[in-house]
C-alpha cells in the first residue's frame, strides 16, 4: 500500500484509523466533516474495493500513540480524486485523538457487509437536516429529545455522510412533528458508534413522550446550490454551500451543460441559454470563488457530481463569476 | 514560558509601526499566534493570526494595513501602515496551547502584557 | 465573516448570586469557544476552552456550555474577586478568524 497512508487497527488491513505521513511522520486525521465520500477514496488509494462506514478511530485498538499528533483537522473529497493527498485539506487548528477518523472498506479479500442505513432526517431541506426517525422492523420511529445528546447527532450526521453536526435538541417546528410512532428515549451514545443503532437506549416503544418533543437535528449539508441578485430563485449568479460557506464558480470552461445541470438540480426547467452580456448583469461576487473548470455531461443531478478543481483552487476573479438563467 | 509585545510608540498620523511578539521558553514552530487589541476602555478586538505552517488570516478591517510574519523561531511582528487615531490601543499577542499528547488545542492560554500604540498630532 | 454577539453587555449582581452570559456564534463553530476574564491593565484569563472545558487552575464556579451557535458562561457563588470584564472567543476554522464577543461588564455587589 502507499507509504502516505494507512489504516489501522482493523481486522484486515481495509478497516481501522486513519493514519497519514507527513514529513516523515505518522499522524491521525481528525473526522470534522469526514464521511462516505472520504471513505470511499481513502478506499481507492489503498486498493480495498468500496467504502462501507466511517466508524470513528477510537474503536480501534491499540489507540494513538500520544506522541503521535492530529496532522489534519478536515478532508473534503468529491469522491472522484485517486488519493486523499488530492482531497481538499485542512490544517489542524483544534481537534483530540478522541475524534480521530476511522475507516472501513469492503476489504476484497472477505465478505464484509455494509451495515444497511436505517436511519434519516424527515421533512426537512435536504437529508442533512430534519426530524431524526430510525427504522425498525420495516417501520420508520421518531426519536424523543429526552437524553438526546450532541454526541448522539455526531452518529447521525455521519452515519448519513452529512460532515459535522451542526445542531441538536432543536425543537420541532409545528408542521414538522412526526405523526409516526415514538420508537425511544433516554439515547446515551458516546459518539463513537457506527450506527444509531448501536448506540444504547430505553425500551423500544417505552417511553411517554409526545411527538412536540421529536429530535430535530442539523448537520454540515455536504453541497448546496442556489442562485442569486436575480429576480427570482431561479435566475442570477451562482453560489455553491462547501464548509458551511457560500462561494462563487469561475466561468472558466463553463457552457450549456452546466447550466443545464443547475437548472435540473434547483427544479428550473431548462437553461434559456443567456448571452454572455446577460450574464453580467448580476456584478461579482464577494468572499469565496469555491469552484473553476467546472466539466459536466448534462446527464448529473447535481453540480456535485461535475468533474472540477479541487475546493478553492482556481485562477479567477469574481469577474468571471458564473451566473444561470433557467425558465423557472 | 512566556510571551512579550514590544514596540509600542506614540506616532503620528500617518505613519507606519511594526510591533515585535517574542517567545521565552518555547519557539512558533508548533503554535498558532494571534494579535488581538484594545482600544481604551473598549473590548478586545482580533486582528489577525499566523499559524504553525505560516499561514495568515485578518479581520477583514486590517486587511491591507496589516501584515503578521515570522521573523525568527522565537519571533513574530506585526507590522502597521497608515496608522490613524482609530488605531490607539493596546496591542496584545497570545499564543495556542499547540499539541498536548498530540492532540492539538486551539485555545489562546497564553497572552502577553501588551504594548501601547498612541496615534496623535 | 464570523461575528460573535454577546449577551448582556453589563450585570449586577449580589455576592453568592449567579451571572450567565450568553454568546452567539453567526454560524456554526461546533465547540471551538472559550471564555476569558479581564481585569484593568491586565491581559485576559482563559477560563474555559471547548465551549465547556475548565481550564487549570481555575474554579469550577465558573461553567461553560453550549455548541454550534449558542453558548453560555454561568458564573455560581459570586465573589468580589470575579468583579470583571467576560469575553467569548471563537477559534474555530482556518478560514474563521478569532473573533471575540463585545463583551460584558460584570460587577459584584
Known amino acids: 500500500s502507499p507509504s502516505g497512508v494507512r489504516l489501522v487497527g482493523g481486522l484486515h488491513r481495509c478497516e481501522g484509523r486513519v493514519e497519514v505521513e507527513q514529513k516523515g511522520q505518522w499522524g491521525t486525521v481528525c473526522d470534522d466533516g469526514w464521511d462516505i465520500k472520504d471513505v470511499a477514496v481513502l478506499c481507492r488509494e489503498l486498493g480495498c474495493g468500496a467504502a462501507s462506514g466511517t466508524p470513528s478511530g477510537i474503536l480501534y485498538e491499540p489507540p494513538a500513540e500520544k506522541e503521535q499528533k492530529v496532522l489534519i483537522q478536515s478532508v473534503s473529497c468529491t469522491g472522484t480524486e485517486d488519493t486523499l493527498a488530492q482531497c481538499e485539506q485542512e490544517e489542524v487548528y483544534d481537534c483530540s485523538h478522541d475524534e480521530d477518523a476511522g475507516a472501513s472498506c469492503e476489504n476484497p479479500e472477505s465478505s464484509f457487509s455494509p451495515v444497511p442505513e436505517g436511519v434519516r432526517l424527515a421533512d426537512g431541506p435536504g437529508h442533512c437536516k430534519g426530524r431524526v426517525e430510525v427504522k425498525h422492523q420495516n417501520q420508520w420511529y421518531t426519536v424523543c429529545q429526552t437524553g438526546w445528546s450532541l454526541r448522539a447527532a455526531k452518529v447521525v450526521c455521519r452515519q448519513l455522510g452529512c460532515g459535522r453536526a451542526v445542531l441538536t435538541q432543536k425543537r420541532c417546528n409545528k408542521h414538522a412533528y412526526g405523526r409516526k410512532p415514538i420508537w425511544l428515549s433516554q439515547m446515551s451514545c458516546s459518539g463513537r458508534e457506527a450506527t444509531l443503532q448501536d448506540c444504547p437506549s430505553g425500551p423500544w416503544g417505552k417511553n411517554t413522550c409526545n411527538h412536540d418533543e421529536d429530535t430535530w437535528v442539523e448537520c454540515e449539508d455536504p453541497f448546496d446550490l442556489r442562485l442569486v441578485g436575480g429576480d427570482n430563485l431561479c435566475s442570477g449568479r451562482l453560489e455553491v454551500l462547501h464548509k458551511g460557506v457560500w462561494g462563487s464558480v469561475c466561468d472558466d470552461n463553463w457552457g450549456e451543460k452546466e447550466d443545464q445541470v443547475v437548472c435540473k438540480q434547483l427544479g428550473c426547467g431548462k437553461s434559456l441559454s443567456p448571452s454572455f452580456r446577460d450574464r453580467k448583469c448580476y456584478g461579482p461576487g464577494v468572499g469565496r470563488i469555491w469552484l473553476d473548470n467546472v466539466r459536466c455531461s448534462g446527464e448529473e443531478q447535481s453540480l456535485e457530481q461535475c468533474q472540477h478543481r479541487f475546493w478553492g483552487f482556481h485562477d479567477c476573479t469574481h469577474q468571471e463569476d458564473v451566473a444561470v438563467i433557467c425558465s423557472g | 514560558q512566556s510571551v512579550k509585545e514590544s514596540g509600542g510608540d506614540l506616532v503620528k498620523p500617518g505613519a507606519s509601526l511594526t510591533l515585535t511578539c517574542t517567545a521565552s521558553g518555547f519557539d512558533f514552530s508548533s503554535n498558532t499566534m494571534c494579535w488581538v487589541r484594545q482600544a481604551p476602555g473598549k473590548g478586545l478586538e482580533y486582528i489577525g493570526y499566523i499559524s504553525y505552517s505560516g499561514a495568515t488570516h485578518y479581520a477583514s478591517w486590517a486587511k491591507g494595513r496589516f501584515t503578521i510574519s515570522k521573523t525568527l523561531s522565537t519571533t513574530v511582528t506585526l507590522q502597521m501602515t497608515s496608522l490613524t487615531d482609530a488605531d490607539t490601543a493596546t496591542y496584545f499577542c497570545?499564543?495556542?496551547?499547540?499539541?498536548?499528547?498530540?492532540?492539538?488545542?486551539?485555545?489562546?492560554?497564553?497572552w502577553g502584557p501588551g504594548t501601547l500604540v498612541t496615534v496623535s498630532s | 465573516e464570523l461575528v460573535m454577539t454577546q449577551t448582556p453587555s453589563s450585570a449586577s449582581e449580589p455576592v453568592g448570586g449567579t451571572v450567565t452570559i450568553k454568546c452567539q456564534a453567526s454560524?456554526?463553530?461546533?465547540?471551538?469557544l472559550a471564555w476569558f476574564q479581564q481585569k484593568p491593565g491586565q491581559p485576559p484569563k482563559l477560563l474555559i476552552y471547548?465551549?465547556?472545558t475548565l481550564e487549570s487552575g481555575v474554579s469550577s464556579r465558573f461553567k461553560g456550555s453550549g455548541f454550534g451557535t449558542e453558548f453560555t458562561l454561568t458564573i455560581s457563588d459570586l465573589e468580589c474577586a470575579d468583579a470583571a470584564t467576560y469575553y467569548c472567543q471563537s477559534y474555530y476554522g482556518s478560514g474563521y478568524g478569532k473573533t471575540f464577543g463585545g463583551g460584558t461588564d460584570v460587577v459584584v455587589k
Open positions: 497570545a499564543r495556542d496551547r499547540g499539541y498536548v499528547d498530540g492532540s492539538y488545542y486551539g485555545d489562546f492560554n497564553l
Open positions: 454560524q456554526s463553530i461546533a465547540s471551538r
Open positions: 471547548r465551549a465547556s
